[in-house]
């Protein structure tokens, strides 16, 4: 797609295999694990990235699997089923025929069941709250400067339309970034907030999916902004369906 002929790579996704076998000898890149052709001028979908991550050698996986008491996405990594467009299939199952329903960012939204479990539709995650804590600094960051830097990051690095960054909240040392994108708002070609949030999550953990310059260089008026922990909360257009047993 966009990789130059002389060195066929995918700028937006390290987890690809590329070769100059596209039309006219153009570079074509396919995601590891699925073999799906990806558009290297934009973000790769989270589903294809998770699948690629699970197909990589175990020692290449640097993240620790969250334990069962983690607040968010507490199922951790799994090998997802993706549709031909790279979206998560509504129903996911593991090798032992345990199945569950997921939302558009691949997070479980029902209790686990068996192969008879039905997931009628892929429910869209329309609101993502990214909760960050930054490392101690001499003083608090100026809120408007911090807001501008983070909005610029999502616009430039992830190519997320500015209208989808709903708000940036700050109470030192906690920063919250709110992403909102309803089904009706997302036009063809728009980056999905779930994909942008996943790329951001990997970036702040020092596991950038981009080739080239590498990691983030977040600065507010020249002062480095270093993130020491991240939590991401997902809100779906239709509330999740968990039994009361899970809530107690």
């Amino acid at each position: 797609h966009t990789a130059a002929q002389d060195n066929c790579t995918c700028p937006t996704n390290k987890m690809t295999v590329c070769s100059p076998d596209g039309p006219g000898g153009r570079c074509q890149c396919r995601a590891l694990g699925s073999g799906v052709a990806v558009d290297c001028s934009t973000l790769t979908s989270k589903c294809l990235l998770l699948k690629a991550r699970m197909s990589a050698p175990k020692n290449a996986r640097t993240l620790v699997r969250p334990n069962e008491h983690a607040l968010v996405d507490n199922d951790g990594l799994y090998d997802p089923d993706c549709d031909p467009e790279g979206r998560f299939k509504a129903r996911q199952c593991n090798q032992t025929s345990v199945c569950w329903c997921v939302n558009s960012v691949g997070v479980r939204r029902t209790d686990k069941g068996d192969l008879s479990l039905r997931c009628d539709e892929l429910v869209r995650t329309h609101h993502i709250l990214i909760d960050l804590r930054h490392r101690p600094t001499a003083g608090a960051f100026n809120h408007s400067d911090l807001d501008a830097e983070l909005r610029r990051l999502f616009r430039e690095r992830y190519r997320l339309h500015p209208k989808f960054v709903a708000a940036v909240h700050y109470e030192q040392p906690t920063i919250q970034i709110e992403l909102r994108q309803n089904t009706s708002q997302k036009a063809a070609g728009d980056v999905d907030i779930g994909d942008a949030a996943y790329y951001f999550e990997r970036d702040v953990k020092g596991e950038s999916l981009f080739q080239g310059r590498g990691g983030l260089d977040l600065r507010v008026r020249g002062e480095p902004l270093q993130v020491e922990r991240t939590l991401i909360y997902y809100l779906d257009e239709i509330p999740p369906k968990f039994s009361m047993k899970r809530l107690t």
Epitope: D6, R157, D217
Partner: antibody
Framework: AVTLDESGGGLQTPGGGLSLVCKAS????????MFWVRQAPGKGLAWVGV????????NYAPAVKGRATISRDNGQSTVRLQLNNLRAEDTGTYYC???????????????????WGHGTEVIVSS | ALALTQPSSVSANPGETVEITCSGG???YGWFQQKSPGSAPVTVI????YRLSDIPSRFSGSASGSTATLTITGVRVEDEAVYFC??????????FGAGTTLTVL
């Protein structure tokens, strides 16, 4: 308005070194990447290199790699190009340029340049 | 790739629409106008399709895959210039095209 003023050009001897300085004004210098681009007489534009806003990252064209160093002083709003072991083919007009996309995964791209200096002429000759 | 690929020249009558293409880059494209050799380039389009506020609205840019297009809708005599495209290769080295000379007949 954005202003970029280059200085330090002139007649240089082969094998010697030059130091070009670009003084920036009219924008928050600390927030933007800076580029150097050159143009040989009668030829097209050629990307020389880039420095990110903090000065922690630089990238150079193969033609100058190992001979060029780009540095910046955010306090003085200046960016410098040091070019050593000069050759006749280094002759041309050197432009300082402002980047617009410091977070982009393709931030080094010439497609991110939004403002240019007037240029300073360098002649390498014995 | 040592340079981006663009046509060496295009010509048009005043009022016509002109398209100049550029291919072979990886990442953002920009378009730069140079009215005479040795004069400073002027950015017409950056980041594929962003136009600076002092650039007339008849200039527009688009990009699809590894090809970018500069469109001048209703070309004028004062648009006569050499237009360079800029991007990068996949090793993140910046690149320019050799330039397209626009002649307004």
């Amino acid at each position: 308005a954005v202003t970029l003023d280059e200085s330090g050009g002139g007649l240089q001897t082969p094998g010697g070194g030059l130091s070009l300085v670009c003084k920036a004004s009219g924008f928050d210098f600390i927030d933007y990447d800076m580029f150097w681009v050159r143009q040989a007489p009668g030829k097209g534009l050629a990307w020389v290199g880039v420095i990110n806003r903090s000065g922690s990252y630089t990238n150079y064209a193969p033609a100058v790699k190992g001979r060029a160093t780009i540095s910046r002083d955010n306090g003085q709003s200046t960016v410098r190009l040091q070019l050593n072991n000069l050759r006749a083919e280094d002759t041309g007009t050197y432009y300082c340029a402002k980047g617009v996309c410091t977070h982009c995964w393709d931030a080094d791209s010439a497609g991110n340049i939004d403002a240019w200096g007037h240029g300073t002429e360098v002649i390498v000759s014995s | 790739a040592l340079a981006l690929t663009q046509p060496s020249s295009v010509s048009a009558n005043p009022g016509e629409t002109v398209e100049i293409t550029c291919s072979g880059g990886s990442g953002n494209y920009g378009w730069f106008q140079q009215k005479s050799p040795g004069s400073a380039p002027v950015t017409v389009i950056y980041n594929n399709n962003y136009r600076l506020s002092d650039i007339p609205s008849r200039f527009s840019g688009s990009a699809s895959g590894s090809t970018a297009t500069l469109t001048i809708t209703g070309v004028r005599v004062e648009d006569e210039a050499v237009y360079f495209c800029g991007s990068a290769d996949s090793t993140y080295v910046g690149l320019f095209g050799a330039g397209t000379t626009l002649t307004v007949l």
